[in-house]
C-alpha cells in the first residue's frame, strides 16, 4: 500500500442560475467516452471565466456531476448528457461529487523517500545516537591500547 493516494469524497447540491452565456462550464465523460477508467460518469472539464459556475464558485474542474434537476446522469451517452444540460432550464440544480486528494499519513513526513510513513527524525535521531556511542567506545578502546 506504499504511496497510496486517498480521496475524501463529498457530495453537494449546487443551484445555479443560467447567466447571459449559460451555465459556463464544459463536461467530459459518458458511456461512449469514459474519462475515468471503469466509470462512465460525467465530469466537469472546464469552468469558463466569468460564467455562472465560476461566479458561484462551488463547482470545480474534476467534479463528477451525479444529477441535473433530479435526473440521474448514469449510463448516458456524452451528447445526451450535453443535451440534458442545454435543456435544463433557467434554474439548474446539480448534485455534485467533489474528490479532495488527501495525504495518507502525517503531513510533511510522507513522500517517495519515506514510503513507510515513519517521520524521518525518528530514524535519524537513533542512528545519530548510535554513531556517537560507537565513536566514543572506539576512542576509549584506542586509549586503552
Amino acid at each position: 500500500m506504499n504511496g497510496r493516494v486517498d480521496y475524501l469524497v463529498t457530495e453537494e447540491e449546487i443551484n445555479l442560475t443560467r447567466g447571459p452565456s449559460g451555465l459556463g462550464f464544459n463536461i467530459v465523460g459518458g458511456t461512449d467516452q469514459q474519462y475515468v477508467s471503469n466509470d462512465s460518469g460525467i465530469y466537469v472539464s472546464r469552468i469558463k471565466e466569468n460564467g455562472a459556475a465560476a461566479l458561484d464558485g462551488r463547482l470545480q474542474e474534476g467534479d463528477k456531476i451525479l444529477s441535473v434537476n433530479g435526473q440521474d446522469l448514469k449510463n448516458l451517452l456524452h451528447q445526451d448528457a450535453v443535451d440534458l444540460f442545454r435543456n435544463a432550464g433557467y434554474a439548474v440544480s446539480l448534485r455534485v461529487q467533489h474528490r479532495l486528494q488527501v495525504q495518507n499519513g502525517p503531513i510533511g513526513h510522507r513522500g517517495e523517500g519515506d514510503p513507510s510513513g515513519i517521520p524521518i527524525f525518528m530514524v535519524l535521531v537513533p542512528v545519530f545516537a548510535l554513531t556517537m556511542v560507537a565513536a566514543w567506545a572506539f576512542m576509549r578502546y584506542r586509549q586503552q591500547l
Epitope: S21, G22, Q33
Partner: nanobody, 126 residues
Framework: QVQLVESGGGLVQPGGSLRLSCVSS????????IGWFRQAPGKEREGVSC???????YYIDSVKGRFTISRDNAKNTVYLQMNSLKPEDTAVYYC?????????????????????WGQGTQVTVS
C-alpha cells in the same frame, strides 16, 4: 507542451478544393472539441466549423454543403475538406481546441472560448 499546427492552405482558383489539417500534441486529443476559424483582412474572426469530442459536426450556413470536418483520433488530427471554394473564403484559417463539450452552446457559438490556438494557414481563392 501543447501545440496545434495547421497545414494545407494555399492559392486556389474559384471552384477549387483544399484540405486543411490540424495536428495536435501535448494533450489528450480524444476529449477535445476542435474548431476551425477564419479571419479575413479587416474582418472579425469567425467560426467556420467544429467537431465535438464524440464527432458531432457543426458548420456556419455559408459553408454548409461545401465544407466537411472530420477527425482521426489515432492521428490526433482534424481535417477540413473545402470544396467549391469562393473568393469570399479567402482568409487565414486557424484551428483551436477546447477541453470537453460546453453545456451551453455548440462549439461555434460566439460565447465559446477555446483553450488552445494554432498559428494559422493562409487560404487564398483568386
Amino acid at each position: 507542451q501543447v501545440q496545434l499546427v495547421e497545414s494545407g492552405g494555399g492559392l486556389v482558383q474559384p471552384g477549387g478544393s483544399l484540405r486543411l489539417s490540424c495536428v495536435s500534441s501535448g494533450f489528450i486529443f480524444d476529449y477535445y472539441a476542435i474548431g476551425w476559424f477564419r479571419q479575413a483582412p479587416g474582418k472579425e474572426r469567425e467560426g467556420v466549423s467544429c467537431i465535438s469530442s464524440v464527432g458531432r459536426a457543426y458548420y456556419i450556413d455559408s459553408v454548409k454543403g461545401r465544407f466537411t470536418i472530420s477527425r482521426d483520433n489515432a492521428k490526433n488530427t482534424v481535417y477540413l475538406q473545402m470544396n467549391s471554394l469562393k473568393p469570399e473564403d479567402t482568409a487565414v484559417y486557424y484551428c483551436a481546441a477546447d477541453f470537453g463539450s460546453s453545456v451551453d452552446s455548440t462549439c461555434l457559438s460566439k460565447e465559446q472560448r477555446f483553450d488552445y490556438w494554432g498559428q494559422g494557414t493562409q487560404v487564398t481563392v483568386s
